[in-house]
Structure formats: structure tokens, C-alpha cells
């Protein structure tokens, strides 16, 4: 998708994105909050498909690790925080039951504010 | 996941999240930029599974439709922008080929800044 930096834009929070395989991931949290094992491969009509995910998180090496960029510091404390979304994955639960479940993965880095009360 | 508002936090950009079915979605853009049809159901070992997605976008009715919250307006113009990520979905391309492809879906609302040139 189009790169904001090309349009002379900056993000309030710096993020990094990467492809993560199920082998790297190993486990994940499902919608009920339980830990499940993410299976490495998914059976499809023509054999098996490697299971992997596109993940985005806050850049721990970025400028914004100390707080968000462009914030009005008179009024606000700020923090860049990785947020999660749900994607479907073939998983196995603690009782060895295999099934398609929605799991949480990192999908974004957003800025959260807390008001400065009296300085 | 834990609600920032409960911790006395505010988001720089207001977002809304919803579950979107393939029937609602109908089409999507794949990684090569082509438009594909999103199939309503996915065959699994025990029959068929309805295909749906967890999507997050900027709230068009929110306070931040005019710009991001908490920004230093002396130096920055700001805009809340919906960003996308990739998830795997069973799709059909323009040549009627069915397969698992990564498609773009809305996953977040982030703030982008452009520097103010003189006030």
C-alpha cells in the first residue's frame, strides 16, 4: 500500500512489519483468552500450505519508543502501543483438539494519551 | 483486550471495529493489487466454515475526523488514516481460479503528520 513517507508524511508512532511463520510463532492467544498451538501447515485440496501471518508492532528501536511524535506535551503524556486484531488460524488447544480459531496477532502501533494533571 | 479508556487513556485517533462476512465484503485486493472475489465459505474436514474478518477503521463519526487528538498544532497538520494489513482468505481471481491468497483488510486507525510550513 502507498507509503506515507513518500507523501511527506510521518507517523505519530514508528512501526515495523514482518511475515511470521507458525513455526516462529508456536503459540497464540485465542478469543477466549486461552493459549493455543499454531499449526505449521494447513491441509488444502492440493496438499499443504505453510501457515504464516503479517504482523505489525511498535518499533522498539524507533524514535517514538519514548513517546509519540508530534504530541502537545503541555497537556499529554503519550505512549506508542502495539494493538492486536484477530485472524483465523488452524490451531490445537490444550486438550489436543485441532480446529480453526481466531487468534490475536499484532497488527498496528497506535498512540495512546493520558492527560497531565497539574504540573 | 484491555480497554485503554478504562486506564484513563485516550486514543489519538478514534476507531471502530466490526466483524465482516465474506458476503458483506464480496471483493478484496490481493497482494499483487488485483481484485479477487472472497468466497463465502471455506471447506474444512467437518463441512464448511463461514469466512469472515475482524476489521478496524477510523470512526467517521468520531471527534478525530477533523484531525488527530492531542497533536501540537503549532508544528503539525494531522489526519487519522485507516491502515491495512494482510490476512489469508479463500478467494477466486478474475480467471475463476480458486485459491488461498493474502488480501488486504482494514486493521487500524493511525495518525499521520505533515509539517506546517510557517503559521
Amino acid at each position: 500500500h502507498s507509503d506515507p513517507a513518500r507523501r511527506g508524511e510521518l507517523s505519530v508512532c514508528d512501526s515495523i512489519s514482518e511475515w511470521v511463520t507458525a513455526a516462529d510463532k508456536k503459540t497464540a492467544v485465542d478469543m477466549s483468552g486461552g493459549t493455543v498451538t499454531v499449526l505449521e501447515k494447513v491441509p488444502v485440496s492440493k496438499g499443504q500450505l505453510k501457515q504464516y501471518f503479517y504482523e505489525t508492532k511498535c518499533n522498539p528501536m524507533g524514535y517514538t519508543k519514548e513517546g509519540c511524535r508530534g504530541i502537545d506535551k503541555r497537556h499529554w503524556n503519550s505512549q506508542c502501543r502495539t494493538t492486536q486484531s484477530y485472524v483465523r488460524a488452524l490451531t490445537m488447544d490444550s486438550k489436543k483438539r485441532i480446529g480453526w480459531r481466531f487468534i490475536r496477532i499484532d497488527t498496528s502501533c497506535v498512540c495512546t494519551l493520558t492527560i497531565k494533571r497539574g504540573r | 483486550h484491555s480497554d485503554p479508556a478504562r486506564r484513563g487513556e485516550l486514543s489519538v485517533c478514534d476507531s471502530i471495529s466490526e466483524w465482516v462476512t465474506a458476503a458483506d465484503k464480496k471483493t478484496a485486493v490481493d497482494m499483487s493489487g488485483g481484485t479477487v472475489t472472497v468466497l463465502e465459505k471455506v471447506p474444512v474436514s467437518k463441512g464448511q466454515l463461514k469466512q469472515y474478518f475482524y476489521e478496524t477503521k477510523c470512526n467517521p463519526m468520531g471527534y478525530t475526523k477533523e484531525g488527530c487528538r492531542g497533536i501540537d498544532k503549532r508544528h503539525w497538520n494531522s489526519q487519522c488514516r485507516t491502515t491495512q494489513s494482510y490476512v489469508r482468505a479463500l478467494t477466486m481471481d478474475s480467471k475463476k481460479r480458486i485459491g488461498w491468497r493474502f488480501i488486504r483488510i482494514d486493521t487500524s486507525c493511525v495518525c499521520t503528520l505533515t509539517i506546517k510550513r510557517g503559521r
Epitope: 497537556h75 499529554w76 492527560i115 504540573r119 | 471527534y63 477533523e66 498544532k73 503549532r74
Partner: antibody, heavy 118, light 108 residues
Framework: EVQLLESGGGLVPPGGSLRLSCAAS????????MGWVRQAPGKGLEWVSA????????YYADSAKGRFTISRDNSKNTLYLQMNSLRAEDTAVYYC???????????WGQGTTVTVSS | EIVMTQSPAVLSVSPGDRATLSCRAS??????LAWYQQKPGQPPRLLIY???TRATGIPARFSGSGSGTDFTLTISSLQSEDFAVYYC??????????FGGGTKVEIK
Amino acid sequence: EVQLLESGGGLVPPGGSLRLSCAASGFIFDDYDMGWVRQAPGKGLEWVSAIDHGGYARYYADSAKGRFTISRDNSKNTLYLQMNSLRAEDTAVYYCAKLDYYYYMDVWGQGTTVTVSS
Amino acid sequence: EIVMTQSPAVLSVSPGDRATLSCRASQSVDIKLAWYQQKPGQPPRLLIYDASTRATGIPARFSGSGSGTDFTLTISSLQSEDFAVYYCQQYDDWPPLTFGGGTKVEIK
């Protein structure tokens, strides 16, 4: 020309309420923080409240906390001060002020008089 | 809370003379200090900000100096329209924003 015009003052009994308004013109209202300052008869200036440009960060003097609420409607270029549980010591001229980024007051309104008396 | 103390409370000066007004902060406010002039029945008017910078349209006879805790407003040659009450205000540590009690400059 930058202008601030207060309204809504008047005579109110102790315990009563008033809502002051301040109509702004001549500048980009939602780019600036705004505030209220009052002046009791024959006395000096006392800061009452301030609000950031977006209407989220709000600050109050101890004398106003829990009784006064500052707000703004950027679509109407208007600042408000809702005053509840008014006391005799709230009697004053209330000025609306445009705040510079660093919080000195670079533009003042003409003021509106609030009298709290039975 | 930073307490601002102005002295003297009243300053009697002849037209054409120099007037020196003092403002003291209970703790350092760096240079985050403003001066205002107020005439009877009128709102205050910003004269000086950042301790020594004249606001737009303010005549050169008004000058400010100081940093930390001690500040001075000087009117080099008093004109008839300068007889008024002058207030200082700190904006370094807030809330609250705090004003001095004022100095009344009157005709001697």
C-alpha cells in the same frame, strides 16, 4: 481583527447557576487554547480555568474545581463556562482570553459581570 | 502553587519620569513571565511576554527584564495614557496560572 465577546453574566442568588459564553472571531479558534480570568470588584486578576484547543485537557483553579466546567464548541467558535453552586465570592467580572501556546493571554474580551447576591 | 508578589502596591510618578515596577516569584519561573496593563473599566492588555519581549503594537518605552525569580517592568518616560494598574503573570508552572496583586501607577 481578533475579537472575543463574552455574554451570559447577570444577577444570581447564592447556590444558583450561570453559563457564560465567549464568541471568538478573527482567528482560527480551534488552533488555540482558551481560558477564563475573573476580577472581583476593586481586586486583582484571578485565573479561573483553561481548555486545550481540542476540548479535552481542562484545568481549574482550586476555587473553581467541582463547581465550574469549561467547554468549547469549535464548530461555533465559542467558549463556555458553566458555573454551578455560585457563592458571593464568585462575584466578579469574568474575562475570556485567548491563550498563547505558552499560556500567557494575548487577547482579552471586554468581560461580563456576574453578581451573586440574595 | 507559585506566588507572585508585586511591589510597590502604588507608585506615584510624574509624567515624563521613569517608572520601575517589580515582580517576584516564590520560585524560579525561568523567563515565563508576562506583564499586563489595565485601565479602569477596560480588560487587561498584554504588554510583555517571555519577560522581555514586547507584544505587537506596544511602544518601545515599555521594557521588561529579569529571569528566575526577579523581574522588572520599566516605563522609560511616562505618558498620560500609561497611568493604570500593571499585573505580572507566571506561566512556567501551571495549573494554576498565577498573577501578582498589581501595581497602580498614579500621577504624582
